[in-house]
């Protein structure tokens, strides 16, 4: 359930515009009334229509001074950084004769592959069409052709080998134009998958759509296998357009069901036919009950890193193996494996942070719990206990972008103490003293203060991409002198279109109440005048592991509701949400729906205290797990919200996903935690909407959050006789795209402008 | 938490030699940066050794580069300075400090006193 990613950068995002300024946001104020004049609010068609979506500039490295992109008509050109060259490795019109939306160069530069009939599956899986492309000779590649449509498809790190999965079986080309060789035969529609995740290891798990790993240099392909012949599978209709609608069937593991079962194999892709695919062993303390695969690491061709999880999360061993050529098997010595446990809630963040190994191929860097409850990085050369913690302090390091011979690249949220910033650091590991240098912290103060970054081989260059909270900015830097290089993207046509636009005003501050910080970000009316009363919209995520509070730029729904509506909108993180320490993470262990709750509801009582709240005209609004938690909201008895809208939400635990809720609230069996599972749900506090007005709105097709959350919630309402308005979409999935958003966000801001009273 | 205790200090004539120890107790001493530092009377704190617990590498200020040596014996949770070739400029009160690696030495001992003279 990662819904929280999509609201904070899709359509439902919550930030805005803003330069902040000793916290508060605010835009400069106009001078002359005849400028002043000329401006306009947002309206709802500039969000549904994305007037002011913004681009990045993500450099598609292909070594230490190249990158290829796409061009705006559609080239792909090479940039060499070095010489300042750039030329066109293929043209608009080779992309355009096979319909192409992607590309794929081989590293050898020989052979691009080209995708297109693009078929969206889950959150991250599609199906494709691929053609290769032979650059030296300006043709396509004819003969042995590929298959349609293939699940996923990839190059070797080196030379131009295929991978490729279709019908999910894995098959091996040595050279575009040979045969293929097929290394599994047991693939089978929903029952074994090889290659490729099922439907809960790619949502809650891996996050990706494959499952194969080729080491460093193509000698071998790892590759996951998913049995899941004994999970219960979850059936919903698909209307359609025919005569009769279609079942789609997906094998589904709720809470306490039946699981996938994984095994690891690795192939000799030189000599495939050889002795085939070798499977790696599982430790054996993982092994003696049900458990999951995190992920899997190269570390040299000889050497690979597998993680592993108990099925009750809190245990994760890392498991390094080496080949044994004498035997053509992988041995994972027990001196090798490093576990990882919590005794406070589960192991990680929202996953297990994977390794970045160091250029011995033993000992490696990897962010975990420090001592005092804070993530961190830490080195491993031998056991977890003698880890040599590199990162300190009441902040958390978030993600480790790059370890060289003499540097470590990573983010953080350490600068001026503000959690929902992203800044990017280098610390220095081969000399004294150990310097860290803040790459990012000062270059664009105000506009930019959350960074994500993507290197080149050896860190010789990287691009860092600004996410606000001013308009966003990609730009390419030198890897050892950290000066800017150039601009890659700065948002020009979207800088002069605001131009004349009245944006919200935003701030991010904090609340301190019994010992608990709630950070919030508070989204003002541009005429903003405290001495007047304003309708209060929550925006709520508070899954596990979420931020919501974050300086990112974005102009949105709830950017709209403040400029035109006249609403203010606060977004608050609770108990449950990352990157504060483990005692406000972990607060929420095996309790959902406990504490996210209490601390909107606390929130709110302090910002009718602030005195420009109408406490007559209070709401709520959550998507997916915001859902969960602005349902239980409005029916926690307090009087405060006078409505409210779930879309999507879950509505008991035990209708929602094994990997993910079991992480969070174990196993709902009666020797463990089926008591709060009960108690956790939405439809046992039926009784409590009769006072509220509440919008519950669903996709018919959700593969997440299945429907079922909604009809069940439907049903206890109608069995207690209490009043609610409802909405379907259908054959809509988690998401609801494309038209639907239209539709739900128009409905949406009908349903609140009539609960606060706001003529249409 | 990490305690530092040193010992091994005192009086010792130009030239001669002297083996400073360092006792951690608490967290594991080899998960820290750790370094000797000293500080003369009426002069700041300076550092002249220290060892980085990912490789092992030593780093010596040019006055005492070749002279002393810093080294650390993880079993034990020792660290030792090995000073030869001592000097009259070498008289100080000298200090062992940990650190984690990005905020460099947050851990202090009480210090042993040196004192070189003829």
């Known amino acids: 359930m990662k819904t929280w990613v999509k609201i904070v950068f899709g359509v439902a995002t919550s930030a805005v515009l803003a330069l902040l300024v000793m916290c508060i946001v605010l835009r400069p104020s106009r001078v002359h009334n005849s400028e002043e004049n000329t401006m306009r609010a947002l309206t709802l068609k500039d969000i549904l229509n994305g007037t002011f979506s913004y681009k990045t500039f993500f450099p598609n490295w292909i070594s230490g001074q190249e990158y290829l992109h796409q061009s705006a008509d559609n080239n792909i050109v090479l940039y060499n950084i070095e010489t300042g060259q750039s030329y066109t490795i293929l043209s608009n019109r080779t992309m355009k004769s096979v319909n192409a939306s992607n590309y794929g160069l081989s590293p050898d530069r020989q052979f691009v592959y080209l995708e297109s009939d693009y078929s969206k599956l889950w959150r991250y899986s599609y199906t494709a069409t691929y053609y290769i492309y032979d650059l030296s000779n300006g043709e396509f590649v004819r003969g042995n052709e590929l298959p349609r449509p293939i699940q996923y498809l990839c190059w070797s790190p080196v030379g131009s080998k295929l991978a490729y999965v279709y019908q999910n079986n894995i098959y091996l080309k040595q050279r575009p134009g040979d045969p293929p060789f097929q290394i599994t035969f047991n693939g089978r529609e929903n029952k074994i998958f090889n290659g490729i995740p099922d439907w809960v290891y790619e949502e809650e798990m891996l996050a990706t759509k494959y499952a194969l790993w080729w080491s460093p240099n193509g000698k071998f392909l790892a590759y996951a296998e998913f049995n899941d012949t004994d999970i219960p599978v979850i059936a919903y209709s698909y209307y359609g357009d025919e005569q009769y609608p279609r079942t789609i069937n997906i094998p589904y593991p709720k809470a306490g069901a039946k699981n996938p079962v994984v095994r690891i194999f690795i192939i000799d892709t030189t000599y495939p036919a050889y002795v085939g695919p070798q499977e790696v062993p599982v430790p054996a303390m993982i092994a003696s009950s049900d458990y999951y695969f995190s992920w899997l690491t190269w570390v040299t061709d000889e050497r690979v890193c597998l993680q592993w999880l108990k099925r009750v999360q809190n245990v994760s061993v890392l498991s390094i193996c080496d080949f044994r050529e004498d035997w053509q098997t992988w041995d994972c010595p027990k001196t090798q494996e490093h576990i990882e446990e919590s005794r406070t809630g589960w192991a990680g963040g929202f996953f297990v942070s994977t390794p970045v190994f160091s250029y011995d191929a033993i000992s490696y860097y990897k962010i975990f719990s420090d001592k005092d409850g804070y993530k961190h990085i830490h080195y491993i050369k031998d056991t977890v206990e003698n880890a040599i913690q590199i990162t300190s302090g009441k902040w958390e390091a978030i993600n480790i972008f790059r370890v060289t011979q003499d540097s470590l690249f990573y983010s953080s949220n350490e600068f001026e103490e503000y959690p929902g910033r992203r800044n990017i650091y280098r610390i220095s590991i081969g000399s004294y003293p150990p310097s860290k240098k803040c790459v990012t912290c000062h270059l664009r103060k105000e506009r930019c203060q959350y960074y994500t970054a993507s290197f080149s081989d050896y860190a010789k260059y990287y691009a860092l991409v600004c996410y606000g909270p001013g308009i966003p900015i990609s730009t390419l830097h030198d890897g050892r002198t950290d000066q800017e290089i150039k601009i890659l993207e700065e948002n020009k046509e979207l800088e002069n279109a605001l131009k004349n636009i009245q944006l919200p005003k935003e701030e991010i501050k904090k609340l301190e109440v019994d010992e608990i910080t709630l950070w919030y970000k508070m989204i003002l009316p541009p005429q903003f005048d405290r001495s007047k009363k304003y309708p209060l919209l929550i925006q709520v995520y508070g899954g596990p592991c979420s931020q919501s509070v974050r300086s990112v730029f974005a102009v949105n729904w709830i950017s709209y509701l403040a400029s035109k509506e006249g609403m203010v909108i606060a977004l608050v993180d609770g108990r449950g949400t990352a990157f504060q320490g483990d005692k406000l993470l972990y607060a929420v262990y095996r309790k959902l729906g406990v504490y996210e709750v209490e601390d909107q509801i606390t929130a709110v009582r302090k910002f009718i205290e602030m005195g420009f709240i109408d406490e007559k005209r209070i709401a709520i609004w959550g998507w997916s797990y915001g859902g969960y938690v602005s349902s239980l909201a409005l029916a926690s008895g307090t009087g405060l919200f006078k409505c409210g809208i779930a879309v999507a939400p879950v509505s008991s635990w035990e209708y929602y996903a094994s990997v993910y809720t079991e992480r969070f609230m174990g196993l709902p069996t009666k020797d463990d935690n089926l008591e709060h599972y009960k108690n956790s749900t939405v439809m046992a506090r039926a009784e409590y909407f009769r006072n509220v007005d509440y919008l519950l709105i669903h996709g018919t097709a959700d593969d997440n959050v299945h429907f079922q959350n909604s009809a069940q919630i439907a049903k206890a309402l109608v069995n207690a006789q209490v009043d609610f308005q409802a909405m379907w979409y259908s054959d809509q999935n988690h998401g609801l795209s494309g038209l639907s958003t239209n539709h739900l966000y128009t409905h949406m801001t009908h349903f609140l402008k009539q609960c606060f009273s706001l003529s249409d | 938490e990490v305690q530092l205790v040193e010992s091994g200090g005192g009086l010792v004539q130009p030239g001669g030699s002297l083996r400073l120890s360092c006792a951690a107790s608490?967290?594991?001493?080899?998960?820290?940066?750790m370094g000797w530092f000293r500080q003369a009377p009426g002069k700041g704190r300076e550092l002249v050794a220290a060892?980085?617990?990912?490789?092992?590498?030593?780093y010596y200020p040019d006055s005492v580069e070749g002279r002393f040596t810093i080294s650390r014996d993880n079993a034990k949770r020792m660290v030792y300075l090995q000073m030869n070739s001592l000097r009259a400029e070498d008289t100080a009160v000298y200090y062992c400090?940990?650190?984690?690696?990005?905020?460099?030495?947050?851990?202090w001992g009480q210090g042993t006193q040196v004192t070189v003279s003829s």
């Open positions: 400090a940990a650190g984690h690696w990005d905020s460099h030495f947050n851990y």
């Open positions: 060892i980085n617990p990912l490789d092992s590498n030593t």
């Open positions: 608490g967290s594991t001493s080899n998960n820290y940066f």
